[in-house]
Interface confidence: low
């Protein structure tokens, strides 16, 4: 038989016995000659053992590249494959020799008193008991004990082959402690050596690498990789590593078993790969394979080796982040670097510290972003080894959906007298500013609830059909003014005004503002009345502790049953898209008030007096009158605001100043408070008296000293006083230069 593929120029070695199988009797001499075209060698069964001394390999006398193998007095154990081959090649010729020894039909491994067979309990696995035969056509059975069982070849999964041994499914003999082969020759039984049966596990549950991923080092650092295999019991593990630089000088591999808890159904094995000083060539994929013979599992990790410590920003690092108020904002610091850098965040140059609203780490997280979070955020990466720094600026823009200022006054707006010109406003704050503010309208009667209908909180009006203000047929004549931009409370706001040229019909008006992140709307109830009229005496806006009267005047010939009510607190705030319910249709929310009736020649006047008005008196007051003929109720609403009493304060400081004789001094003293304070000026703690050179204007707010003289030098005090106290500011005016004598002197 030939083994290996012949090369172009070399023929296979030629054997003197041209057979694949040779059968000879025991105690005879085996002699085979092999000829070839270059140096030859022989291999024979058991040629690694002491039996080698019996084997003679000699050079042929009649030619180059020829060797003869001789074994005198062969025994059954010499059965096996005899191979003649060219040195350092795979080219070979093989003959299988059976030495028929009826006294010893099984070939024994030299020095083996017994053998060991390792089996697994896998149903699909077979095991080979290596009881090879010196005779090819023996009747062989397998004996297993204890209890004793005999297995006979069945032509299927149980078989015996003289060159291989006895093959049987492993689970059939897993109970046994030992097995042996038995041959019957002429009613005589011959037994092979005993084989101890060792049941081994094979299952590997998992192979875990630690660190498992993202291993980064710089040149010269130590790499330590642990590979842990978890297996079932009775398993032996063989580890095999693959890595980029296999010929590494400083590589160390240590394999050991790990202790597991007693009673554990699992074994652990550990293999540790150590490279003391990594180089760039050590970068790459490291694979650990654990093999139990029947099963192999592997795991890999990528090791990155950097030339030196470094830090840089990754390509995904954004320069602009946009968010809407209330959202959670996450700005990751995306970097490339080894070792991982220290990360510090700054806002407008000020370091950010983590708290319940902001987390400043690998990711800058703002839990609920607000307008004040808008700004430039700088992230600084510092390499902990090289101290190299990289910085990157991220601009955070926080968008605000349109908010309509007037919406906070969740009250039914005052009624409007028939025929008057009225202005409705929507003051919108949005970032970016609204790209449009549109106005819509619809008739009140198309929308109003019938008194019998229950008022729905979510949509008190059944109507949906809003009309554009350009289409004012059947309604009031309207003009929308160009949007104005105003700085209100330090914020840039857009003010849209709608002018109703003549209040003829009751209607609802809606302003809708839209920007890139949302929309806002406000619905205004525009109730037109020919009925009662409300006036406030003495002032539109009383201050607390002052007295105020609300007068409701109605034509006596048209109206009767005048009554004052106060609108109770709203049951629920009005949500976006909801409409205010007409007051007259929903008297449940009104509180009846005591009032005094007066009459003149044409009108009835119902007066409701508030003595010592307090902040609790603020709100919406309703005057209800009934039409004498139709009995229809007419309502007028007036919102009353009571100003809080505030002690005087002076805004701004008086500055000390130096002035030359003959020049002028102009200073301002702005005071606020409620009631409004009185301003007085003092010089050197004496009341300042106006004369031709000293002028006080704007309620004493502005002081002008014309053509100053040396004697105008001194301490000037501005004092603002009300019933709630006084506030004052002081400044020293220095007058320089010599006083000129005048002719008048």
């Amino acid at each position: 038989a030939s083994v290996g593929l012949p090369s172009v120029s070399l023929d296979l070695p030629r054997l003197s016995i041209q057979k694949d199988i040779l059968t000879i009797k025991a105690n005879t001499t085996l002699q085979i000659t092999c000829r070839g075209q270059r140096d030859l060698d022989w291999l024979w069964p058991n040629n690694q053992s002491g039996s080698e001394q019996r084997v003679e390999v000699t050079e042929c006398s009649d030619g180059l590249f020829c060797k003869t193998l001789t074994i005198p007095k062969v025994i059954g154990n010499d059965t096996g494959a005899y191979k003649c081959f060219y040195r350092e090649t795979d080219l070979a010729s093989v003959i299988y020799v059976y030495v028929q020894d009826y006294r010893s039909p099984f070939i024994a491994s030299v020095s083996d008193q017994h053998g060991v067979v390792y089996i697994t309990e896998n149903k699909n696995k077979t095991v080979v008991i290596p009881c090879l035969g010196s005779i090819s056509n023996l009747n062989v059975s397998l004996c297993a004990r204890y209890p004793e069982k005999r297995f006979v070849p069945d032509g299927n999964r149980i078989s015996w082959d003289s060159k291989k041994g006895f093959t049987i499914p492993s689970y059939m003999i897993s109970y046994a402690g030992m097995v042996f082969c038995e041959a019957k020759i002429n009613d005589e039984s011959y037994q092979s050596i005993m084989y101890i049966v060792v049941v081994v596990g094979y299952r590997i549950y998992d192979v875990v690498l630690s660190p498992s991923h993202g291993i980064e080092l710089s040149v010269g650092e130590k790499l330590v990789l642990n590979c842990t295999a978890r297996t079932e019991l009775n398993v032996g593990i063989d580890f095999n590593w693959e890595y980029p630089s296999s010929k590494h000088q400083h590589k160390k591999l240590v394999n050991r078993d790990l202790k597991t808890q007693s009673g554990s159904e699992m074994k652990k094995f550990l293999s540790t790969l150590t490279i003391d000083g990594v180089t760039r060539s050590d970068q790459g994929l490291y694979t650990c394979a654990a093999s139990s013979g029947l099963m192999t599992k592997k795991n890999s990790t990528f090791v990155r080796v950097h030339e030196k410590p470094f830090v840089a920003f990754g390509s995904g690092m954004e320069s602009l982040v946009e968010a809407t108020v209330g959202e959670r904002v996450r700005i990751p610091a995306k970097y490339l670097g080894y070792p991982p850098p220290e990360i510090k965040w700054y806002k407008n140059g000020i370091p950010l510290e983590s708290n319940h609203t902001i987390k400043a780490g690998h990711v800058l997280t703002i839990m609920e972003v607000s307008e004040r979070d808008t700004g430039n955020y700088t992230v600084i990466l510092t390499n902990p080894i090289s101290k190299e720094k990289q910085s990157h600026v991220v601009s955070l823009v926080v968008y605000v959906p349109p908010q309509i200022g007037e919406k906070s006054l969740i009250s039914p707006v005052d009624s409007y007298q028939y025929g008057t010109t009225q202005t409705l406003t929507c003051t919108v704050y949005a970032i970016p500013p609204p790209h449009h503010i549109h106005w819509y309208w619809q008739l009140e009667e198309e929308c109003a609830n019938e008194p019998s209908q229950a008022v729905s909180v979510t949509n008190p009006y059944p109507c949906e059909e809003w009309r554009s203000v350009e289409d004012f047929q059947g309604g009031n004549k309207i003009e929308v003014n160009k949007n104005q931009f105003a700085l209100i409370e330090g914020k840039n706001k857009t003010v849209s005004t709608l002018v109703i040229q003549a209040a003829n019909v009751s209607a609802l008006y809606k302003c809708e503002a839209v920007n890139k992140v949302g929309r806002g709307e406000r619905v205004i109830s525009f109730h037109v009345t020919r009925g009662p009229e409300i006036t406030l005496q003495p002032d539109m806006q009383p201050t607390e502790q002052e007295s105020v009267s609300l007068w409701c005047t109605a034509d006596r010939s048209t109206f009767e049953n005048l009554t004052w009510y106060k609108l109770g607190p709203q049951p629920l705030p009005i949500h976006v898209g909801e409409l205010p319910t007409p007051v007259c249709k929903n008297l449940d929310t009104l509180w009846k008030l005591n009032a005094t009736m007066f009459s003149n020649s044409t009108n009835d006047i119902l007066i409701m007096e508030l003595k010592n008005a307090s902040l609790q008196d603020q709100g919406d007051y309703v005057c209800l009158a009934q039409d004498r003929k139709t009995k229809k109720r007419h309502c007028v609403v007036r919102q009353l605001t009571v100003l809080e009493r505030v002690a005087p304060t002076i805004t701004g400081n008086l500055e000390n100043q130096t002035t030359s004789i003959g020049e002028s001094i102009e200073v301002s003293c702005t005071a606020s408070g409620n009631p409004p304070p009185q301003i007085m000026w003092f010089k050197d703690n004496e009341t300042l008296v106006e004369d031709s050179g000293i002028v006080l204007k704007d309620g004493n707010r502005n002081l002008t000293i014309r053509r100053v003289r040396k004697e105008d030098e001194g301490l000037y005090t501005c004092q603002a006083c009300s019933v709630l106290g006084c506030a004052k500011v002081e400044a020293f005016f220095i007058i320089e230069g010599a006083q000129e004598k005048t002719n008048l002197e």
Epitope: P211, H213, G214, G316, L320, V321, E322, P332, Y335, P340
Partner: antibody, heavy 131, light 110 residues
């Protein structure tokens, strides 16, 4: 199957704007960066910018700053590229292309290697600018 | 520099090897290993052939390989076949956090 399907061809006058859409399917739209690349007739490829569909963050090539706007609508897994103040030399095929790079937090230690490259491309949208 | 420098055209006979170079600067190819190569057949969208200098996506034959030395990246196609005839573009990530394409190379199989 991962796919990017772009809107149809457009003919525009100089000074106008064009908005090209790119609908993604077969993967998590918010999980990968999206690039826009254009190719003028007989010319090479030109990178215009990218958008992070997750955050809406963008990064534009210097050449297109101020003229290009990249947006996305995550509800319909669609990216948009709008180019304004069109000139005749904007006549080109415009492609959207998904990046291999998944949107993850780069900064986390022990992160796997990061790969970059545009692995899935749209079929292209021809934009012709002519008076 | 507006684009990475590639030869306008290269050619080779079937079975031969060809190499297309892509030269940048320290600010792009020289700093990052983020170079990709794309093949574009006439009238078609580009197709990713190599990413991260030398990595091949699945489905790309191992006849194509990528490498980098200094400021120059290279694409090598061995065992040239007629279906390799196409335009090839490189692209690199830059220190400006943008991407830059090469001018493109027309590969002709003789």
């Amino acid at each position: 199957e991962v796919q990017l399907v772009q809107s149809g061809a457009e003919v525009k006058k100089p000074g106008a704007s064009v908005k090209v859409s790119c609908k993604a399917s077969g993967y998590t739209f918010t999980g990968y960066y999206m690039h826009w690349v254009r190719q003028a007739p007989g010319q090479g490829l030109e990178w215009m910018g990218w958008i992070n569909p997750n955050s809406g963050g963008t990064n534009y090539a210097q050449k297109f700053q101020g003229r290009v706007t990249m947006t996305r609508d995550t509800s319909i897994s669609t990216a948009y590229m709008e180019l304004s103040r069109l000139r005749s030399d904007d006549t080109a095929v415009y492609y959207c292309a998904r990046d291999l790079q998944g949107i993850t937090i780069f900064g986390v230690a022990n992160s796997p290697p990061y790969y970059y490259g545009m692995d899935v491309w749209g079929q292209g949208t021809t934009v012709t600018v002519s008076s | 520099q507006a684009v990475l420098t590639q030869p306008r055209s290269v050619s080779g006979s079937p079975g031969q090897s060809v190499t297309i170079s892509c030269t940048g600067t320290r600010s792009d190819v020289g700093t990052y290993n983020y170079v990709s190569w794309y093949q574009q057949l006439p009238g078609k969208a580009p197709k990713l052939m190599i990413h991260d200098v030398s990595k091949r996506p699945s489905g790309v034959p191992d006849r194509l390989s990528g490498s980098k030395s200094g400021n120059t990246a290279s694409l090598t196609i061995s065992g040239l076949q007629s279906e390799d005839e196409a335009d090839y573009y490189c692209i690199s990530y830059t220190l400006h956090r943008t991407w830059m394409f090469g001018g493109g190379t027309k590969l002709t199989v003789l």
